[in-house]
């Protein structure tokens, strides 16, 4: 309905999201030197993180380094950190790839493996692969409610994607329920031809596009959103270029009057909500 005489104006938008769902996670712990599986329940506060802008994040996988404290310890063994004598370590050296500051000593890491000693949060995080399958694989059943308010100030028109009387027990479906603002995460990935379980291992970035093509003329009035989805991270990235989406954060606590932390390397999916469109009126 693109009429030549219509005055077009770009949309101004605000977005608010609410993620819901519970995940049962099987974590591996070590008890008296023996590996053991324990069950944990993760709720919204455990797997979502506040983000700026029109984005929300859902954790799908993680690696934990528990009980870290600031002390001296050997670096985690890699080609870069292995040493045979103190000559292989440089006091005060801060390698950007390292987790600490070298003391200049070459110390035993384990068995006959020796690495450079560092001042750091110890024990040093291990270099390891993200768990397979992802620990929060069941996040594909989580849902997100997207509240989108839009404004065309020049036309003095405001509306939102959730209208009164909307059945909020609905789930979005491209053909059967295209106006439902509640999206199942697994369905979003199915729409783009991606497998949620695969992306959940390393994480990724998904775009949720909300397109408003509004005809604000009284006789032809139409102003409803159209939802579509687009994978935004590079699926073809090789290992050296850091595939997926991850970050580290720490939970700090005090034990015996000493500050400690649990370091968590979080893998997950960042959802970017992209709102665009125009409002036309003569």
């Amino acid at each position: 309905s693109d009429k030549l005489y219509q005055r077009k104006e770009p949309v101004i938008s605000s977005v608010h999201t609410k993620v819901k769902g519970i995940a049962e996670v099987k974590e591996e712990i070590v008890e008296n030197g023996v590996k053991k599986l324990v069950h944990s329940v993760f709720d919204t506060a455990d797997y979502t993180f506040p983000l700026q802008g029109n984005s929300f994040f859902v954790m799908t996988n993680f690696l934990k380094t528990e009980g870290q404290e600031q002390r001296l310890c050997p670096e985690y063994p890699t080609r870069r950190t292995l040493c045979s004598s103190d000559r292989g370590c440089k006091k005060g050296w801060m390698d950007p790839q390292s987790k600490g500051i070298q003391t200049g000593r070459c110390v035993v890491y384990e068995g006959n493996q020796k690495t450079c000693e560092v001042s750091a949060w110890c024990p040093i995080e291990a270099v390891e692969e993200a768990p397979r399958p992802a620990l929060l694989n069941s996040a594909e059943n989580f849902t997100v409610l997207i509240k989108n308010n839009i404004d065309f100030p020049g036309h003095n028109y405001t509306t939102r994607n959730i209208l009164p009387g909307l059945n909020i027990t609905c789930t979005f479906h491209k053909t059967q329920n295209p106006q439902c603002p509640i999206f199942r995460l697994g369905d979003i990935f199915r729409e783009t031809g991606d497998n949620f379980s695969d992306v959940a291992i390393q994480g990724g970035i998904m775009g949720i596009e909300i397109y408003w093509d509004c005809n604000l003329d009284r006789w032809f009035h139409h102003c409803r959103p159209k939802y579509s989805f687009r994978r935004l991270d590079d699926k073809t990235t090789n290992v050296s270029l850091y595939p997926g989406y991850n970050f580290r954060y720490a939970k700090y606590y005090k034990e015996n009057n000493v500050e400690k932390r649990t370091l968590i390397k979080v893998f997950g999916i960042r959802f970017d909500i992209l709102v665009f469109g125009t409002g036309g009126k003569f």
Epitope: G67, R71, C73, S119
Partner: nanobody, 118 residues
Framework: EVQLVESGGGLVQPGGSLTLSCAAS????????MSWHRQAPGKQRTLVAD???????EYEDSVKGRFTISRDNFKNTMTLHMNSLKPEDTAVYFC????????????WGQGTQVTVSS
């Protein structure tokens, strides 16, 4: 003024037990790694056990499984529980403190004598 005061030494029979204590004052105890060292007559002083502020422990091979080092960061004390004592454990035992990122000790106690003999 920094003070490290050891106590608990004495004469004990082989196979017996003893607990050494070290009371610290004048230092921010929870920022210091604490350690026990020993010096037998005519020998060098050697590290026996070390404990980080957060409780990470390391032991000299000859005492592993027999000695246990622990600390209380609220009371500013450290202890060394010594079990299955042997005559070769006879020495003066010193308590030492080093800032958590230092390689060598900053402060030392006066020492306490431990004698293992029948």
């Amino acid at each position: 003024e920094v003070q490290l005061v050891e106590s608990g030494g004495g004469l004990v029979q082989p196979g017996g037990s003893l607990t050494l204590s070290c009371a610290a004052s004048g230092i921010a105890f929870n920022y210091y790694s604490m350690s026990w060292h020993r010096q037998a007559p005519g020998k060098q002083r050697t590290l026996v056990a070390d404990i980080s502020p957060g409780g990470h422990t390391e032991y000299e091979d000859s005492v592993k499984g027999r000695f246990t080092i622990s600390r209380d960061n609220f009371k500013n004390t450290m202890t060394l529980h010594m079990n299955s004592l042997k005559p070769e454990d006879t020495a003066v035992y010193f308590c030492a403190a080093r800032l958590r990122f230092e390689v060598s000790s900053n402060y030392w106690g006066q020492g306490t004598q431990v004698t293992v003999s029948s």
